[in-house]
Interface confidence: low
């Protein structure tokens, strides 16, 4: 079928269109183009005869048309009037006529649009604004963009006049945006320049900054006022209702208590004619005094006295705070605060309560700290310690003993030998001692402030012969694979060599054995049951030697996995069952039995007379060592057969 395709269908003014013929029959005489939907001689554009290959213009020919041998028609420099239908009349060789009609539409190339507005400075919540997209163009579609986005859905936005007019009702400051309109037709699309909507608004209620309303005397007051407003607001300040100045900022240097009052910022928008005010109340406080601490007892005695610390001065409606050692008060039944927190009482002071203590006065702006106060707690003397710890000395050496007792104030010391006062010094020195210097050496420490005295007595033996040593132990019953044991050879003596023997032999080399403290201490790490031996220590010097009595180490171990005897597991009916359980353990373990999980008796031996097949089952022996806290067990299966059914069965005990 003969068809006409318009390329393009929508044609811009000034451009060209090709009316392209499809399915043109063969063997043609000629063809002719007409303007309109039918063949009309008055509206012929051009005719073409195949034979002569000659084109003949018709009444509707404009000089802009070109016909091609394939019957297609090109129309150049299109004008608006070219819009419409075009008919091709084909005359075949047999003079049979065929017609086909095509069409195209002509649209103008759109100019760049512009936006006109009925109100260049609308007032928020009051005015409406109508934007109109210019020029008015036929067959054009109008589109609107806000901040380069398509129009949001809003009851305040209304399109009218074929979308050419955009009306914003009751404008708000948020409508301050970039508005563009776009005109479209099938052949072009043009966008306008942006129009920025300038919405007049405000002033909103002004905000005064900073928000701080409390100041100290002597500070500068610098208040700034801001109210959202377009155009920017004009500002005025009033203090207690009296006009001050027409500025956005109010600055008053070196304020005093007299500057307290109500500060009003008034914002005015000359375009909207609106005023808004905000009031802030400023309070100026006089500088509070620096606090200090008084005490009812400057030298309290440990475990006897209480101390009351008071924060001065007393100020009404003030919060008092306390710190001990730069930290807030710990929870302690010995610390008590008065109702107003001004007095801190320490009940039954200890030497650890020295402090420092600080109190603080909190006002509206900050906390003022007192200087720290340290308590002078009187304590002691504690039991004095005499050093060195040697108790045996050889004749001819110098004896130098020093005494020390924790005390505040420091203790005064006295030495007594066999109850006789010697001297009032911290150190006792006797040169070139003899056996006559043996005796009881007493150090007496005295605290003159508390009136307390404490003594320590040390027995000093001066002898060329060494005494018989003894062994002390830090653990009399160590647990195997768990504990360490430290043996110490007593006494500690000057210029003495210490030796050790195990089972009469010198010490074996072992990473678990360690000598220390001048060989006076022997440590066994991770003891085992094999360490349960006789240990002897010896002391010797250039004139004598001596050995201690042996000390046997009692190592707690076990229980090991028990063994049930006899080993038999098959028995004949009627025999006696006599099972004995044994486990290596120190001390001896406690034994118990279970048959098929049911507890039986707490004995080492389980005896059942005249067993039957009913006695078949699992026999478990449980062992427990209360000293090591360890347990163990073993299970044995017993089978009882009827008499004579199987050879080789045990007859029982």
């Amino acid at each position: 079928k003969l068809t006409i395709e318009s390329t393009p269908f929508n044609v811009a003014e000034g451009k060209e269109v090709l009316l392209l013929v499809h399915n043109l029959p063969q063997h043609l005489f000629g063809y002719s183009w007409y303007k309109g939907e039918r063949v009309d001689g008055n509206r012929q554009i051009i005719g073409y005869v195949i034979g002569t290959q000659q084109a003949t213009p018709g009444p509707a020919y404009s000089g802009r048309e070109i016909i091609y041998p394939n019957a297609s028609l090109l129309i150049q420099n299109i004008i608006q009037n070219d819009t419409g239908f075009y008919t091709l009349h084909v005359i075949k060789s047999d003079l049979v006529n065929e017609e086909a009609t095509g069409q195209f539409r002509v649209y103008p190339e759109l100019p760049k649009p512009s936006i006109s507005s009925n109100n260049s400075k609308p007032v928020e919540d009051k005015d409406a604004v109508a934007f109109t997209c210019e020029p008015e163009t036929q067959d054009a579609t109008y589109l609107w963009w806000v901040n380069n986005q398509s129009l949001p859905v809003s009851p305040r936005l209304q399109l009218s006049n074929g979308n050419r007019t955009l009306t914003l009702f009751n404008v708000t400051r948020n409508d301050t945006a970039s508005y563009k309109c776009e005109t479209q037709n099938p052949v072009s699309a043009r966008r306008s320049d942006s129009v920025i909507l300038n919405v007049l608004y405000g002033p909103d209620a002004p905000t005064i900054s900073p928000l701080n309303t409390s100041y100290r005397s002597g500070e500068n007051l610098n208040l700034s006022c801001h109210a959202a407003s377009n155009p920017p607001a004009q500002y005025s300040w009033f203090v207690n209702g009296t006009f001050q100045q027409s500025t956005q900022e109010l600055f008053i240097p070196n304020i005093t208590v007299n500057n307290s009052g109500s500060y009003t910022c008034q914002a005015h928008n000359s375009d909207t004619g609106l005023n808004r005010t905000t009031v802030t109340t400023i309070t100026v406080y006089a500088e509070p005094p620096k606090p200090f601490i008084t005490s009812n007892n400057s030298n309290p005695v440990e475990d006897e006295d209480a101390v009351a610390l008071t924060c001065e001065p007393e100020i009404q409606n003030t919060t008092y705070l306390w710190w001990v050692n730069n930290q807030s008060l710990p929870v302690s039944p010995r610390l008590q605060l008065s109702n107003d927190n001004r007095t801190l009482t320490l009940l039954s002071v200890t030497r650890n309560d020295v402090g420092p203590y600080e109190c603080g006065i909190q006002n509206e702006l900050s906390v003022d700290h007192s200087d720290p106060v340290i308590l002078n707690v009187l304590y002691g003397p504690d039991d004095p310690t005499i050093s060195p710890s040697y108790t045996y000395y050889r004749p001819g050496v110098n004896l130098s003993l020093s005494c020390h007792a924790a005390s505040n104030p420091p203790a005064q010391y006295s030495w007594l030998i066999d109850g006789n006062i010697q001297q009032h010094t911290q150190e006792l020195f006797i040169s070139n001692i003899t056996e006559k210097n043996s005796g009881l050496y007493t150090c007496q420490a005295n605290n003159s402030a508390s009136g307390h005295s404490r003594t320590t007595v040390k027995t000093i033996t001066v002898s060329a012969e060494l005494p018989k040593p003894s062994i002390s132990s830090n653990n009399s019953k160590p647990v195997e694979d768990k504990d360490a044991v430290a043996f110490t050879c007593e006494p500690e003596a000057q210029n003495t060599t210490y030796l050790w023997w195990v089972n009469g032999q010198s010490l074996p080399v072992s990473p678990r054995l360690q000598l220390s403290n001048g060989n006076r201490t022997l440590t066994l790490f991770n003891v085992t049951r094999n360490d349960a031996r006789a240990y002897v220590c010896g002391i010797q010097n250039s004139v004598s030697a001596n050995r201690s009595d042996p000390v046997t180490l009692d190592v707690l171990y076990g229980p090991d996995t028990p063994i049930i005897s006899p080993p038999d597991s098959s028995y004949l009916s009627g025999a006696n069952l006599n099972l004995s359980c044994h486990s290596a353990s120190n001390p001896s373990p406690q034994y118990s039995w279970r048959i098929n999980g049911i507890p039986q008796q707490h004995t080492q031996v389980l005896f059942i007379a005249k067993i039957t097949p009913n006695n078949n089952g699992t026999y478990a022996c449980f062992v427990s060592n209360l000293a090591t806290g360890r347990n163990n067990s073993i299970v044995k299966s017993i089978t009882v057969s009827a008499s004579g059914t199987s050879p080789g069965l045990s007859a029982g005990a």
Epitope: Q234, S236, F238, N240, G241, T242, F243, Q244, Q245, S246, H268, S270, N275
Partner: antibody, heavy 117, light 107 residues
Framework: QVQLVQSGAEVKKPGSSVKVSCKAS????????ISWVRQAPGQGLEWMGH????????GYAQKFQGRVTITADESTSTAYMELSSLRSEDTAVYYC??????????WGQGTLVTVSS | DIQMTQSPSSLSASVGDRVTITCRAS??????LNWYQQKPGKAPKLLIY???SLQSGVPSRFSGSGSGTDFTLTISSLQPEDFATYYC?????????FGQGTKLEIK
């Protein structure tokens, strides 16, 4: 258009007081301040004080402190200026005027106060 | 208080003349200055506000300039109705003060 209408001329004896009124119309009475300015015969303008009608707060020039009282009645949109302990040098035309963000923009017609024994 | 000093205190000029009146503040008042015109027996009338803004209804031959401490009122072409006394007034401080006035007389 704002209009400020003042009370009529007064003749006062020295030591007495005078109270001049100023009624506002055609605008919002409380959206500014009412100032009082006087002008002695053949002299310049002299600011005396003002009142903010919205809260009744007044401010006075140091020269008149203690002698002048400025008040306002919002219900009648009227401001008042009372000057006490009058002396002959207080003879002047007293103006009320509206201050609104950029100085005084509207003035009353003036009230002549004559102080004479 | 801020003192305002006008100069000259009096001035003779003819119709059509260009006239300039100056006002000086004792301290900076930014642009918080107004100019008023007063004719005998009348209340003052606002001409210029905020140093340079022309009040509505005032002829454009009046103009104001300046900021800080020095200000000027200019009448570009004097008209017969312009002969009057002119005052400057500061409103930087809430204690408003006026200049002593400049009397403009016909020559």
């Amino acid at each position: 258009q704002v209009q400020l209408v003042q009370s009529g001329a007064e003749v006062k004896k020295p030591g007495s007081s005078v109270k001049v009124s100023c009624k506002a119309s055609g605008g919002t009475f409380h959206d500014g301040a009412i100032s009082w300015v006087r002008q002695a015969p053949g002299q310049g303008l002299e600011w005396m004080g003002h009142i903010i009608p919205i809260d009744g707060t007044a401010g006075y020039a140091q020269k008149f402190q203690g002698r002048v009282t400025i008040t306002a009645d919002e219900s009648t949109s009227t401001a008042y200026m009372e000057l006490s302990s009058l002396r002959s040098e207080d003879t002047a035309v007293y103006y009320c005027a509206r201050y609104r963000f950029y100085g005084i923009d509207y003035w009353g017609q003036g009230t002549l106060v004559t102080v004479s024994s | 208080d801020i003192q305002m000093t006008q100069s000259p205190s009096s001035l003779s000029a003819s119709v059509g003349d260009r006239v300039t009146i100056t006002c000086r503040a004792s301290q900076s008042i930014s642009s918080y200055l107004n100019w008023y015109q007063q004719k005998p027996g009348k209340a003052p009338k606002l001409l210029i506000y905020a140093a340079s803004s022309l009040q509505s209804g005032v002829p454009s031959r009046f103009s104001g300039s300046g900021s800080g401490t020095d200000f000027t009122l200019t009448i570009s072409s004097l008209q017969p109705e312009d002969f009057a006394t002119y005052y400057c007034q500061q409103w930087r401080s809430h204690l408003f003060t006026f200049g002593q006035g400049t009397k403009l007389e016909i020559k």
